[in-house]
């Protein structure tokens, strides 16, 4: 199930959206211009993210439109900040057995969550659905981002970063796929799949096994169809 990873190559255009999914709804994590973080039922310009992989499973998450880093305070509140503080704005990424991703602060141990409660991450735990994320490639036309065209300079090492300040166009390493026991239950995110062609739909990423008459591997959360 490698294509569900938020850390994908340039085939996803660099921009992704993190969303929680229950059997009948989904919320996309968005970082507003004022730094407020919440969820929206659909992709928005503020839910378009760049996720940069660092060593040892750490990631840095940036809101492309707000140009703010996703950060966490000591109480577990998440917010967007223009200032990058390594202690508050780096998260440990882990893929659960069910193929969903969780992000937690190595400093404060709280999970990134769209729910209001603050819960610490414990290895082996089953977090609530609003603390488990999937990723979806950006479906919003880039013109909606209305990013000003940077000034042209003589081509240099600095030129690349100025034209792409958030590194959204640079390929990134793939993460380890989820266990095979789950991957057969989950759809890929190819361009012709429902996940790629449902920018505004209600996700039906249920936690119950949709295969008639049986239950899947422990911890797996197979998808039902989109509505």
């Amino acid at each position: 199930y490698p294509n569900a990873s938020p850390l994908l190559g340039s085939s996803w255009g660099g921009l992704i959206h993190l969303y929680t999914a229950t059997a009948r709804n989904s919320y996309h994590l968005q970082i507003h211009k004022n730094g407020h973080v919440d969820g929206a039922p659909h992709q928005t310009i503020y839910s378009a993210l760049m996720i940069r992989s660092e060593d040892a499973g750490f990631v840095v998450i940036t809101g492309v439109m707000s140009r703010r880093y996703l950060c966490m305070d000591f109480r577990g509140n998440i917010f967007g900040s223009h200032y990058f503080d390594p202690e508050n704005c780096r998260f440990q990424h882990q893929t659960l057995e069910n193929g969903y991703d969780v992000y937690h602060s190595p400093q404060y141990h709280f999970l990134v969550s769209l729910g209001r409660a603050k819960r610490a991450f414990l290895p082996g735990m089953n977090p609530p659905p609003y603390s488990q994320f999937l990723s979806r490639r950006n479906e919003i036309p880039l013109i909606h981002f209305n990013t000003p065209i940077p000034r042209r300079h003589t081509r240099s090492a600095e030129d690349d970063s100025e034209r792409d300040p958030l590194n959204v166009l640079k390929p990134r390493a793939r993460m380890t796929p989820a266990p095979a026991s789950c991957s057969q239950e989950l759809p890929s995110a190819e361009d012709n799949s429902p996940m790629a062609s449902d920018p505004l739909g209600v996700v039906r990423g249920g936690r119950v096994n949709t295969h008639a008459g049986g239950t899947g591997p422990e911890g797996c959360r197979p998808f039902a169809k989109f509505i």
Epitope: T20, T22, A23, R24, N25, Y27, D38, G39, A40, P41, H42, L114, G115, R116, A117, R119, N126, P127, P128, P129, Y130, L200, G201, V202, G206, R207, V208, I227
Partner: antibody
Framework: QVQLVQSGAEVKKPGASVKVSCKAS????????MHWVRQAPGQGLEWMGI????????SNAQKFQGRVTMTRDTSTSTVYMELSSLRSEDTAVYYC??????????WGQGTMVTVSS | AIQLTQSPSSLSASVGDRVTITCRAS??????LVWYQQKPGKAPKLLIY???SLESGVPSRFSGSGSGTDFTLTISSLQPEDFATYYC????????FGPGTKVDIK
């Protein structure tokens, strides 16, 4: 402040349809799913369905498949629930409720629908 | 679908009593459980979300606990305005409610 204001009580005959409205205010309408929940007299709460406010996509409890239609009008921040082929067992109070990721945090005042011949 | 059962279905108590209501899920739902209070003729009111988090404005005598399949709502010292029906709801894979527990005056 967040408010969900529902339409008034209705009396319908068996076989007819009823359409209940729920007007939202005090928040960004398109940022929260809306649910419909009903409660028959003296009974518990029964979840009916959910609507995505931006796309209009819906998902209903299996019990109501084919009989319930949920729609929304983003220009007026209003959601609608239409229940068709009414029977006496559909006599209930119908509530709309806002989804806040981890709970239904705001509810409408309820609309009493009476089905009687 | 995940089923929720509540016990007791009704109870009689006096002002000042400690009241405990349990909700059991047919399979694990992590902490994705909500408690509501409903009074006759009124819409349900959110009390507890994420199993144990108190909704803003709700008195601290209400508390929730549990995770996985077993959950508890506790009213530490019952007040006259607490006589009502209490419902649990799961937000894990669907949105179904428990059958309710009616708390009335002894």
């Amino acid at each position: 402040q967040v408010q969900l204001v529902q339409s008034g009580a209705e009396v319908k005959k068996p076989g007819a349809s009823v359409k209940v409205s729920c007007k939202a205010s005090g928040y960004t309408f398109t940022n929260h799913y809306m649910h419909w929940v009903r409660q028959a007299p003296g009974q518990g709460l029964e979840w009916m369905g959910i609507i995505n406010p931006i796309s209009g996509s819906t998902s209903n409890a299996q019990k109501f498949q084919g009989r319930v239609t949920m729609t929304r009008d983003t220009s007026t921040s209003t959601v609608y629930m239409e229940l068709s082929s009414l029977r006496s067992e559909d006599t209930a109070v119908y509530y709309c409720a806002r989804d806040y990721v981890d709970a239904f945090d705001f509810w409408g005042q309820g609309t009493m629908v009476t089905v009687s011949s | 679908a995940i089923q929720l059962t509540q016990s007791p279905s009704s109870l009689s108590a006096s002002v000042g009593d400690r009241v405990t209501i349990t909700c059991r899920a047919s399979q694990g739902i992590s902490s994705a459980l909500v408690w509501y209070q409903q009074k006759p003729g009124k819409a349900p009111k959110l009390l507890i979300y994420d199993a144990s988090s108190l909704e803003s404005g709700v008195p601290s005598r209400f508390s929730g606990s549990g995770s996985g399949t077993d959950f508890t709502l506790t009213i530490s010292s019952l007040q006259p305005e607490d006589f009502a029906t209490y419902y649990c709801q799961q937000m894990y894979d669907d949105f179904n409610f428990g059958p309710g527990t009616k708390v009335d005056i002894k």
